[in-house]
């Protein structure tokens, strides 16, 4: 049975005999971040039973994690490159505070968590170069982010574990939606 790169296998990028286009570079970059998320999810799932928990909805209500919807212009029906790109960049900027929260949540994968955070910053820069409509991109308020971070860190252990699991799962899905949408651009 085929085993593709995924939650349980490592991808090795194929060698290139020619330079990548900016779109291909972004594609590979997102794949690299997804590898990192995959590793972090492994540690989270091994450490707790959050990945099988049915109580996700309880914790999810307290989080406002970016999610792709049809109105964002990233789906095939009603696809709009500018609207979609704004949604992707805005969403990534909103995820930054959650990625900051993850920084102290891992023991054996501390470097991996840092790599995911730094690679996301680089991805945002790549995409900002691609975006024409930069005025429409709203950057989260630093004070709002700071108070959200404090609030998340003040949760009990179970909620912190659940929050970690939900951030990783949502970020993975958001990046997968991005990957698919960016291939249309």
């Amino acid at each position: 049975a085929p085993v593709l790169p995924g939650e349980d296998s490592k991808n090795v990028a194929a060698p290139h005999s020619q330079p990548l286009t900016s779109s291909e570079r972004i594609d590979k970059h997102i794949r690299y971040i997804l590898d990192g998320i995959s590793a972090l999810r492994k540690e989270t799932c091994n450490r707790s039973n959050m990945c099988e928990s049915s109580k996700e909805a309880l914790a999810e209500n307290n989080l406002n994690l970016p999610k792709m919807a049809e109105k964002d212009g990233c789906f095939q029906s009603g696809f709009n490159e500018d609207t979609c790109l704004v949604k992707i960049i805005t969403g990534l900027l909103e995820f930054e505070v959650y990625l900051e929260y993850l920084q102290n949540r891992f023991e054996s994968s501390e470097e991996q968590a840092r790599a995911v955070q730094m690679s996301t910053k680089v991805l945002i820069q790549f995409l900002q170069k691609k975006a024409k409509n930069l005025d429409a991109i709203t950057t989260p308020e630093p004070t709002t982010n700071a108070s959200l971070l404090t609030k998340l860190q003040a949760q009990n252990q179970w909620l912190q574990d659940m929050t970690t699991h939900l951030i990783l799962r949502s970020f993975k899905e958001f990046l997968q939606s991005n990957l698919r949408a960016l291939r249309q651009m």
């Epitope: 085929p2 995924g6 060698p15 290139h16 020619q18 095939q76 799962r169 899905e173």
Partner: antibody
């Protein structure tokens, strides 16, 4: 293990609508990054991608056939349905459903059903 | 649409032979090229993905190479079970397109 199974009529008349169902097991249609697609192969000819549907209900169609195709899914039943209107004898083919995607939302098919031969004839 | 052209369309070879199949894309698809094997009356089976990545369970005699527009599938030492039709697929952009197939027959 991952399996996909196609079901539907073996014979349809010209101008009729074909409805094919793909029932999957071993993975969930709601797992992010995943999708299910339909590919057909006329006897003795090459493969032709028709359509697919992603985990979040985003859909893709072969532009040459788009006006005739509709793809949908029922996650609770683990089923993906393809309908193709105004069937013609040239649509006679083996119709396959296949799993697509994965962590990188790969544009490839890693598991296939065994296929169902659909003949269009009056 | 990106056209995928395979050559040859068929070939005859003996067990133990080294077999090379080529696939050309009408425009650059980077390494987003996948290979499938299909035996008569059976569904296709994924053989190689992203031009050169091997699939777990696929014998090591199968290898792929190439990037951009020109790709190659190589069977280093043909075995009796390798007699089949091989297809390349554009996995770069929509619509996904396949080559017309290369039938590998017994000499």
């Amino acid at each position: 293990q991952v399996t996909l199974k196609e079901s539907g009529p073996v014979l349809v008349k010209p101008t009729e609508t074909l409805t094919l169902t793909c029932t999957v097991s071993g993975f969930s249609l709601s797992t992010s990054g995943m999708g299910v697609g339909w590919i057909r192969q006329p006897p003795g000819k090459a493969l032709e991608w028709l359509a697919h549907i992603w985990w979040d209900d985003d859909k893709r169609y072969n532009s040459a056939l788009k006006s005739r195709l509709t793809i949908s899914k029922d996650t609770s039943k683990s089923q993906v349905v393809l309908t193709m209107t105004n069937m013609d004898p040239v649509d006679t083919a083996t119709y396959y459903c296949a799993r697509i995607g994965g962590l990188y939302v790969d544009y490839l098919m890693d598991y296939w059903g065994q296929g169902t031969l659909v003949t269009v004839s009056s | 649409d990106i056209q995928m052209t395979q050559s040859p369309s068929s070939l005859s070879a003996s067990v133990g032979d080294r077999v090379t199949i080529t696939c050309r894309a009408s425009q650059s698809i980077s390494d987003y090229l996948h290979w499938y094997q299909q035996k008569p009356g059976k569904a296709p089976k994924l053989l190689i993905y992203y031009a050169s990545q091997s699939i777990s369970g696929v014998p090591s005699r199968f290898s792929g190479s190439g990037s951009g527009t020109d790709f190659t599938l190589t069977i280093s030492s043909l075995q009796p079970e390798d007699f089949a039709t091989y297809y390349c697929q554009n996995g770069h952009s929509f619509p996904w397109t396949f080559g017309q197939g290369t039938k590998v027959e017994i000499k």
